[in-house]
């Protein structure tokens, strides 16, 4: 025998109090799949969280972080403070990168400068706490037919994909 609740589409729930008819989800709740016996409460984006996508009867709200913070965890479960470029976020707060390391992002930790000599290249431009060393072309790049130096990468929003 088919469960009558299986006919209830997303955005509704199977109401046991009303002879298992399909009732619309109440305000501030949703059901993303059919055949649900309850609707889930919508996520509320409060404090450092801001609403990226409003809740609807068929899908939960999605949050991201207010400026100065970035998302961590599946579905942006947490907002963590940004640091400045040239810094890293430690458990004790933002801290300047040590000499020989850099961070060109507002999150993450400081990365060691590239050691150009490992690939037989010379240093074209010394590194800073915000920028890596720039190496000269490798011997392979100087050979006939080799491709030229790559232009800078487009700006991107770093983070785990998908969030």
């Amino acid at each position: 025998l088919q469960d009558p609740c299986s006919n209830c589409p997303a955005g509704t729930f199977c109401d046991n109090n009303r002879n298992q008819i399909c009732s619309p989800c109440p305000p501030n709740s949703f059901s993303s799949a059919g055949g649900q016996r309850t609707c889930d409460i919508c996520r509320q984006c409060k404090g450092v969280f801001r609403t990226r996508k409003e809740c609807s009867s068929t899908s939960n709200a999605e949050c991201d972080c207010t400026p100065g913070f970035h998302c961590l965890g599946a579905g942006c479960s947490m907002c963590e403070q940004d640091c400045k470029q040239g810094q890293e976020l430690t458990k004790k707060g933002c801290k300047d990168c040590c000499f020989g390391t850099f961070n060109d992002q507002k999150r993450g930790i400081c990365r060691p400068w590239t050691n150009c000599s490992l690939d037989g290249r010379s240093v074209l431009k010394t590194g800073t706490t915000e920028k890596d060393v720039v190496c000269g072309p490798s011997p392979a790049d100087l050979s006939p037919g080799a491709s030229s130096v790559t232009p800078p990468a487009p700006a991107r929003e770093p983070g785990h994909s998908p969030q």
Epitope: L72, Q105, I109, C135, P154, G159
Partner: antibody, heavy 120, light 110 residues
Framework: QVQLVQSGAEVKKPGASVKVSCKAS????????MHWVRQAPGQGLEWMGW????????NYAQKFQGRVTMTRDTSISTAYMELSRLRSDDTAVYYC?????????????WGQGTLVTVSS | SYVLTQPPSVSVAPGETARITCGGD??????VHWYQKKPDQAPVLVVY???YRPSGIPERISGSNSGNTATLTLSRVEAGDEADYYC????????????FGGGTQLIILG
């Protein structure tokens, strides 16, 4: 969706070199560092190094310095790892893995692995 | 360079909770990442930066980190959780920035 597809298995003799490729798709190749990690039979994961596909800048684990070279071809969104002077204990599965856009987090996408067998 | 120490194996019955530890000097000051590795498959990131799960990783997998020990916890363990688990940190101050623990085999009893 993000995908890293590696070249096929290789069998090499001691002293030879091997070059493994890792073709990226589903994201901007030059925007994310690529790492190489290997696993020898019955052993754990071992980090080998990274390359910045935008600048070509590299960092290698000291153990591999002088034997490993990481390069990239941005025109075909492909990273390469070449290991020279191969020994029998270089027999391993070699993985490329993507960093998620900033340093200090976990490696979020991995290639399927390339088995390199070094045998005389 | 920095050393991470894991137990070689952890055994647990289905439905129980497994805890896998990763020891290192002042590891609580570092960000620890955990990977699941099954035979003939690529590693999968299951926890990053101590306690955050990537999309698609079930909520019964969690992480914590303080003092000299980081812990990966798998609650209500299932047969499909049987795998090797590796902790990992980045150590910018050394000549070997990427550091993995030796791995722990999670054995599901019965």
């Amino acid at each position: 969706q993000v995908q890293l597809v590696q070249s096929g298995a290789e069998v090499k003799k001691p002293g030879a070199s091997v070059k493994v490729s890792c073709k990226a798709s589903g994201y901007t190749f030059t925007g994310y560092y690529m790492h190489w990690v290997r696993q020898a039979p019955g052993q754990g994961l071992e980090w080998m190094g990274w390359i910045n596909p935008n600048s070509g800048g590299t960092n290698y684990a000291q153990k591999f310095q002088g034997r490993v070279t990481m390069t990239r071809d941005t025109s075909i969104s492909t990273a390469y790892m070449e290991l020279s002077r191969l020994r029998s204990d270089d027999t391993a599965v070699y993985y490329c893995a993507r960093e998620p856009g900033y340093y200090g987090s976990g490696l979020d996408y991995w290639g399927q692995g390339t088995l390199v067998t070094v045998s005389s | 360079s920095y050393v991470l120490t894991q137990p070689p194996s952890v055994s647990v019955a289905p439905g129980e909770t497994a805890r896998i530890t990763c020891g290192g000097d002042d590891i609580g000051d570092k960000r620890v990442h955990w990977y699941q590795k099954k035979p003939d498959q690529a590693p999968v990131l299951v926890v990053y930066e101590d306690r955050y799960r990537p999309s698609g990783i079930p909520e019964r997998i969690s992480g914590s980190n303080s003092g000299n020990t980081a812990t990966l916890t798998l609650s209500r363990v299932e047969a499909g959780d049987e795998a090797d688990y590796y902790c990992q940190v980045w150590d910018s101050s050394s000549d070997h920035p990427g550091v993995f623990g030796g791995g722990t085999q999670l054995i599901i009893l019965g």
